[in-house]
């Protein structure tokens, strides 16, 4: 696994421990919590990042669910089970044998059950809507400048292929970034939209996951873009399965 060889650090993930004991004596960086070696030339999977975060827990967050099939991360932080590739396992359970099914971004998509609960496959989140509200500015941002800046950010900072940024909408003060990535579209080596969205979310909150880089300094034509609220909605390739009780709550 590649890492900055000179001082053995991981540019893309500061929640790692790096040591020159990898293959061939090269620098190898392990994610905290799991100990899995990570590829420091790209983003680390959200599952490994959540597991690392739980080895030094922070306050959980709560979001709201806006529509019938869109999911929001209402459950906050948990210590996930990751598969050998670092992806979320379809079924997650807590210490008290309460289990639930998650999608590819680790968000619960079923009611909670017991150990008999089956989650046959990891359902892919193919559409992510990032809903931002920016702080008041002297005037509205130019839409095309804002669009270009956010596309550049996802391309350069998060290494997400431009084709996966489907659209950037703007109605002052609300900005919406749509990420789309079907299973068939994602090639080997492509950054996952769920991972890119998670890095972006942490950046916006001032909790950058990048090693040694300054926090996110978003500017549109030199004007700071300061976000005061973020909501992220997740749409899965197969709709979630919640009981009517939850849907009418």
């Amino acid at each position: 696994h590649t890492a900055a060889q000179d001082n053995c650090t991981c540019p893309t993930n500061k929640m790692t421990v790096c040591s020159p004991d990898g293959p061939g004596g090269r620098c190898q960086c392990r994610a905290l919590g799991s100990g899995m070696a990570v590829d420091c030339s790209t983003l680390t999977s959200k599952c490994l990042l959540l597991k690392a975060r739980m080895s030094a827990p922070k306050n959980a967050r709560t979001l709201v669910r806006p529509s019938e099939h869109a999911l929001v991360d209402n459950d906050g932080l948990y210590d996930p089970d990751c598969d050998p590739e670092g992806r979320f396992k379809a079924r997650q359970c807590n210490q008290t044998s309460v289990c639930w099914c998650v999608n590819s971004v680790g968000v619960r998509r079923t009611d909670k059950g017991d150990l008999s609960l089956r989650c046959d496959e990891l359902v892919r989140t193919h559409h992510i809507l990032i809903d931002l509200r920016h702080r008041p500015t002297a005037g509205a941002f130019n839409h095309s400048d804002l669009d270009a800046e956010l596309r550049r950010l996802f391309r350069e900072r998060y290494r997400l292929h431009p084709k996966f940024v489907a659209a950037v909408h703007y109605e002052q003060p609300t900005i919406q970034i749509e990420l789309r990535q079907n299973t068939s579209q994602k090639a080997a080596g492509d950054v996952d939209i769920g991972d890119a969205a998670y890095y972006f979310e942490r950046d916006i909150k001032g909790e950058s996951l990048f090693q040694g880089r300054g926090g996110l300094d978003l500017r549109v034509r030199g004007e700071p873009l300061q976000v005061e609220r973020t909501l992220i909605y997740y749409l899965d390739e197969i709709p979630p399965k919640f009981s009517m009780k939850r849907l009418t709550a």
Epitope: C8, V17, P20, P23, M36
Partner: antibody, heavy 115, light 108 residues
Framework: QVQLQQPGAELVRPGASVRLSCKSS????????INWVKQRPGQGLEWIGN????????NYNQKFRDKATLTVDKSSSTAYLQLSSPTSDDSAVYYC????????WGQGTALTVSS | DILLTQSPAILSVSPGERVSFSCRAS??????IHWYQQRTNGSPRLLIS????SISGIPSRFSGSGSGTDFTLLIINSVESEDIADYYC?????????FGSGTKLEVK
């Protein structure tokens, strides 16, 4: 050359806490994991846990989580394994070893728990 | 936890024979497997790291191969009497690291 030095033997009374040491030399102590491995007489090897000396980040085998505590003293390049409330089950040889593929090993400390 | 299964428990060979030890992982661990030799009353020593990387000072008759979950092999091309020892595999894929139960090599 790289060396990990451990005392050859330790005797401890049941229930009395014991601390085993492992002194490193010949490399940058803070840059490599130190692991501890247990071997009971005639048995195989068991990984107890590891510690990364630069900021004392530790991981434990669940089996040893309530038994073992790993620490380091960076000033003397020494790693320690503390065993709480030892019983006869803790009588074993304890090795310290470096890295992820354990390229260097100490000679091992034979711990005897006996009254 | 990742389980490493070593087989057989005991291998008995004649000097000069080629011998292979196997180690199977309960999940895909890529090439994060290491092999050790432990002679009677001695500390283990690293023979092969990351499935196939040779180690300075280890005789060239020792080699390794394999990856994933399949049998990862340690091979001694031509066994010598000094190779009488226990052989262990260990993974470093994720925490906790684990060892196989070992294979004892006897020379006839």
């Amino acid at each position: 050359q790289v060396q990990l030095q451990q005392p050859g033997a330790e005797l401890v009374r049941p229930g009395a806490s014991v601390r085993l040491s492992c002194k490193s030399s010949g490399y940058t102590f803070t840059s490599y994991w130190i692991n501890w491995v247990k071997q009971r007489p005639g048995q195989g090897l068991e990984w107890i846990g590891n510690i990364f000396p630069s900021h004392s980040y530790t991981n434990y085998n669940q089996k040893f989580r309530d038994k073992a505590t790993l620490t380091v003293d960076k000033s003397s390049s020494t790693a320690y394994l503390q065993l709480s409330s030892p019983t006869s089950d803790d009588s074993a040889v304890y090795y310290c070893t470096r890295g992820s593929g354990f390229d260097y090993w100490g000679q091992g400390t034979a711990l005897t728990v006996s009254s | 936890d990742i389980l490493l299964t070593q087989s057989p428990a005991i291998l008995s060979v004649s000097p000069g024979e080629r011998v292979s030890f196997s180690c199977r992982a309960s999940q895909n661990i890529g090439t994060s497997i290491h092999w050790y030799q432990q002679r009677t009353n001695g500390s283990p020593r690293l023979l092969i790291s990351y499935a196939s990387e040779s180690i300075s000072g280890i005789p060239s008759r020792f080699s390794g191969s394999g990856s994933g979950t399949d049998f990862t092999l340690l091979i001694i091309n031509s066994v010598e009497s000094e190779d009488i020892a226990d052989y262990y595999c260990q993974h470093s894929y994720s925490w906790p690291f684990t060892f196989g139960s070992g294979t004892k090599l006897e020379v006839k």
